[in-house]
């Protein structure tokens, strides 16, 4: 018992470790991170009149406050609440586009179909898209050397928690018919472990969302299979249906033609299937 007490007394907490920088498995904070976030905020508020009231310095302060001086494996959704509050935005009903493992096409689509919105078309998603960031416990420094990797280090890191937080909010506020773009080239077209599968699906509100329509994007030109019959799509269909939300699925056999037809719906070739 006395020996145990000695060992207990010698336990060292992570925050008591000497002041060398922790080495994480992931890449460090994106260079010029504060400047990038601030510049993106200014640009966004200039282009979106409904967000002109947003004070970008306050946005940066709230963003910074979520992770600076905090142990980067102990970040919570609560840490991001001041930022979420400042970035509150609504999407009109029937205009939400979710995506999973097919970000580029989803963004190309909303660039053409300007009245539909992905998370990255909203202020907070736009600010953080493709960026990495983390701080260190008890210092005001940003760690540009390394940040925690979701798999190898911890899931409660600043980037993962940010996307979980804003994705949850984005799904919670969706209404009407919600669309989701899924990658038909992947082995798991619907992946329960993706942000869409683990966060967004479970936060769509049955009182506000009448239906989820999945667009399964085919990869190969000769791929004529009905991927809406894929077992993972059936799994998604069941999960959504049991949330009392109707589920529809469409194959997008030709994504190039699909985009072309969004740009030019009157094109005669667009009357046939895509």
């Amino acid at each position: 018992s006395g020996l145990n007490d000695i060992f207990e007394a010698q336990k060292i907490e992570w925050h008591e470790l000497p002041r060398w920088r922790q080495q994480w498995s992931g890449s460090g904070t994106t260079s010029r991170f504060p400047e990038t976030v601030l510049a993106r905020c200014v640009k966004y508020t200039e282009v979106h009149p409904e967000m002109r009231h947003v004070d970008c310095q306050s946005v940066w302060d709230a963003f910074k406050g979520a992770f600076i001086s905090k142990y980067p494996c102990n970040i919570t959704e609560e840490d991001y609440q001041p930022l979420v509050k400042l970035g509150t935005q609504t999407v009109p009903c029937n205009k939400t586009l979710l995506w999973s493992r097919i970000k580029d096409l989803a963004h190309q689509f909303t660039q053409v179909q300007r009245d539909m919105f992905t998370l990255e078309d909203m202020l907070l998603g736009y600010l953080a898209d493709d960026l990495t960031w983390c701080g260190e416990f008890n210092t005001f420094e940003i760690n540009y050397q390394s940040c925690p990797d979701w798999r190898k280090d911890c899931s409660n890191n600043p980037v993962s928690v940010f996307w979980k937080t804003v994705s949850r909010r984005f799904a919670e506020t969706a209404c009407g018919v919600v669309h989701v773009m899924l990658n038909g080239s992947r082995s798991k077209i619907f992946d329960k472990n993706s942000t869409f599968g683990s966060v967004e699906v479970h936060n769509l509100q049955p009182e506000k969302v009448q239906a989820l329509e999945a667009w399964v994007i085919h990869g190969g030109r000769e791929d004529s299979r009905d991927l809406c019959q894929d077992p993972t799509i059936k799994e998604l269909e069941s999960i959504i249906s049991k949330r009392n939300i109707r589920f529809f699925c469409k194959n997008i056999y030709r994504p190039d033609k699909f985009l072309q037809c969004v740009k030019n719906p009157e094109d005669s070739s667009c009357l046939s299937g895509i």
Partner: antibody, heavy 116, light 111 residues
Framework: QSVEESGGRLVTPGTPLTLTCTAS????????VTWVRQAPGKGLEWIGI?????TTYYATWAKGRFTISKSATTVDLRIASPTTEDTATYFC?????????????WGPGTLVTVSS | AAVLTQTPSPVSAAVGGTVTIKCQSS????????LSWYQQKPGQPPKLLIY???TLASGVPSRFSGSGSGTQFTLTISSVQSDDAATYYC???????????FGGGTEVVVK
């Protein structure tokens, strides 16, 4: 908007029987449809559901005994080999105008009697 | 398979009184809230009252209310009227559709 079941009749045990659910005022193909039955003087029993896509799910006790299918305008319930225990009023219920497993719209029911 | 137990049955109530019907599930329903309540009168099909445990269906009087989550649910009828005499059923939806089931029903007698 309404739904109605048809096809109920007196059959001998083992004679396959198909019941049909038809909608008025809306298209059944865009909605989830559930089949429920009620033996005389007894409670309700959930048989199964057909999704918009045609995916079907059944209560454990109903698997292999019942098949739900759909066409553009109707949803069918096939009783493969009826026994006397299948004597009941059969209801189809549609999740119209919204919902899936929630059943706001019921038909009046159709009576199936299985007797030798 | 899941078992939904409704208590009590039958239940007697005076006009203007309150009736509480309980529905207990042997396992948790989907999302802890996928349970609905139906009213059935003799010779008629069931009528939806409450869905997702507590949401009042369109056209249903506000004296009907639902509560509960997971495995324990309650249907409350306040200011009972003679027209409320009927049998009430709960319907649970589960992760495995094979388990989906109605409760045994609770008959409400209005005096």
């Amino acid at each position: 908007q309404s739904v109605e079941e048809s096809g109920g009749r007196l059959v001998t045990p083992g004679t396959p029987l198909t019941l049909t659910c038809t909608a008025s005022g809306f298209s059944l193909s865009r909605y989830y449809v559930t089949w429920v039955r009620q033996a005389p003087g007894k409670g309700l029993e959930w048989i199964g559901i057909i999704y918009i896509s045609g995916t079907t799910y059944y209560a454990t006790w109903a698997k292999g005994r019942f098949t739900i299918s759909k066409s553009a305008t109707t949803v069918d319930l096939r009783i493969a080999s009826p026994t006397t225990e299948d004597t009941a009023t059969y209801f189809c219920a549609a999740a119209w105008p919204v919902g899936t497993y929630v059943l706001p719209l019921w038909g009046p029911g159709t009576l199936v009697t299985v007797s030798s | 398979a899941a078992v939904l137990t409704q208590t009590p049955s039958p239940v007697s109530a005076a006009v203007g009184g309150t009736v509480t019907i309980k529905c207990q599930s042997s396992q948790s329903v989907v999302n802890a809230n996928n349970l609905s309540w139906y009213q059935q009168k003799p010779g008629q099909p069931p009528k939806l009252l409450i869905y997702l445990a507590s949401t009042l269906a369109s056209g249903v009087p506000s004296r009907f209310s639902g509560s509960g989550s997971g495995t324990q649910f309650t249907l409350t009828i306040s200011s009972v009227q003679s027209d409320d005499a009927a049998t009430y059923y709960c319907l649970g939806v589960y992760d495995d559709d094979g388990d989906n089931a109605f409760g045994g029903g609770t008959e409400v007698v209005v005096k």
